[in-house]
Interface confidence: low
């Protein structure tokens, strides 16, 4: 079932998924100037059986302008360069999350995708949190949250972080300190407030999401 | 990707009642993204009034419409509202609705700063009489 929330509001600290787990959702978003394929995904999602799980559907971006032609999947290094550092990718996860049965590992990019990714995370997902860029992180307790079905709703547990505003940074389970941090958080992305939903379908829903009410056609 | 189009903007008394609607259009899944509201006054900056994440669990809203204004969402309906209650004068502008990817790798939080809005509306009129 998908989470029909987002992660807790930590003042001055992101969240990170080290791995995925079935179910999840990543929407197949394209860069300006470019759109998905006709008849291309409107996500991939996180599928698999108990011993190896694999993102379904390949996203495909063409570009705005050219209706018929497509772009291969395989980024070119230089479209690779120009994503954001938002997306760490698969270096930055420790072996023991990236490998659990059940999970993804963090999908490679497509040519010409959005600098920024989009999930839709299921209960049982687990995040990691850290304290923006000239925050100090004081753990009272783990710095992660869970997304858990109670009584028929889902919830995010609380993560045990408080970030203070010291200059110095906390680090995601398994990372080193950035020496200068090239992977550093953009500027315009360290606000403090937080955002979340109710995105409230099941799972098994997935497969029709392309005609779902949560789908908005072109006019 | 994503088309805005506001609704509900006219003239009220101070004191009165007005709701703004923003209708979303695009083949996207709408609940992808944060919305807010912006308001521009003949000659000012575009300011800020409230901002609601992708799921409604979170909102935001300027000092200046705490307790009078409320932002909701209908991901059903791939609309956002406005709820304008107690109005002033001041309330008076041309209101935007904004919207921006949230990235769910690294969290993206409620943005309040007007450049960190991808796709904007063209905007409806409130006027605020005494």
């Known amino acids: 079932e998908l989470c029909d929330d987002d992660p807790p509001e930590i003042p001055h600290a992101t969240f990170k998924a080290m791995a995925y787990k079935e179910g999840t959702m990543l929407n197949c978003e394209c860069k300006r100037g470019f759109r998905r394929i006709k008849s291309g995904s409107l996500y991939m999602l996180c599928t698999g059986n108990s011993s190896h799980s694999s993102w379904d559907n390949q996203c495909q971006c063409t570009s705005s302008a050219t209706r018929n032609t497509t772009k291969q999947v395989t980024p070119q290094p230089e479209e690779q360069k120009e994503r954001k550092t938002t997306e760490m990718q698969s270096p930055m996860q420790p072996v023991d999350q990236a490998s659990l049965p059940g999970h993804c590992r963090e999908p490679p990019p497509w040519e010409n995708e959005a600098t920024e990714r989009i999930y839709h995370f299921v209960v049982g997902q687990m995040v990691y949190y850290q304290c923006v860029q000239g925050y100090r992180a004081l753990h009272r307790g783990p710095a992660e949250s869970v997304c858990k079905m109670t009584h028929g709703k889902t919830r995010w547990t609380q993560p045990q972080l408080i970030c203070t505003g010291e200059m110095e940074t906390s680090q995601f389970p398994g990372e080193e300190k950035p020496q200068a941090s090239p992977e550093g958080r953009p500027e315009s992305e360290t606000s403090c407030l937080v955002t979340t939903t109710d995105f409230q379908i099941q799972t098994e829903m997935a497969a029709t999401m392309e005609t779902s009410i949560f789908t908005t056609e072109y006019q | 990707q994503l088309q805005l189009v506001e609704s509900g903007g006219g003239s009220v008394q101070a004191g009165g009642s007005l709701r703004l609607s923003c209708a979303a259009s695009g083949r996207t899944l709408y609940s992808s993204y944060g919305m807010a509201w912006f308001r521009q006054a003949p000659g000012k900056e575009r300011d800020f009034v409230g901002s609601?994440?992708?799921?409604?669990?979170?909102?935001s809203y300027a000092d200046s419409v705490k307790d009078r204004f409320t932002i909701s969402r209908d991901n059903a309906k791939s609309t956002v509202y406005l709820q304008m209650n107690n109005t002033k004068p001041e309330d008076t502008a041309v209101y935007y609705c904004a919207a921006y990817t949230y990235s769910g790798s690294f969290y993206s939080t409620v943005k309040t700063h007007r450049d960190e809005y991808q796709y904007w509306g063209q905007g409806t009129q409130v006027t605020v009489s005494s």
């Open positions: 609601i994440s992708r799921y409604g669990t979170y909102t």
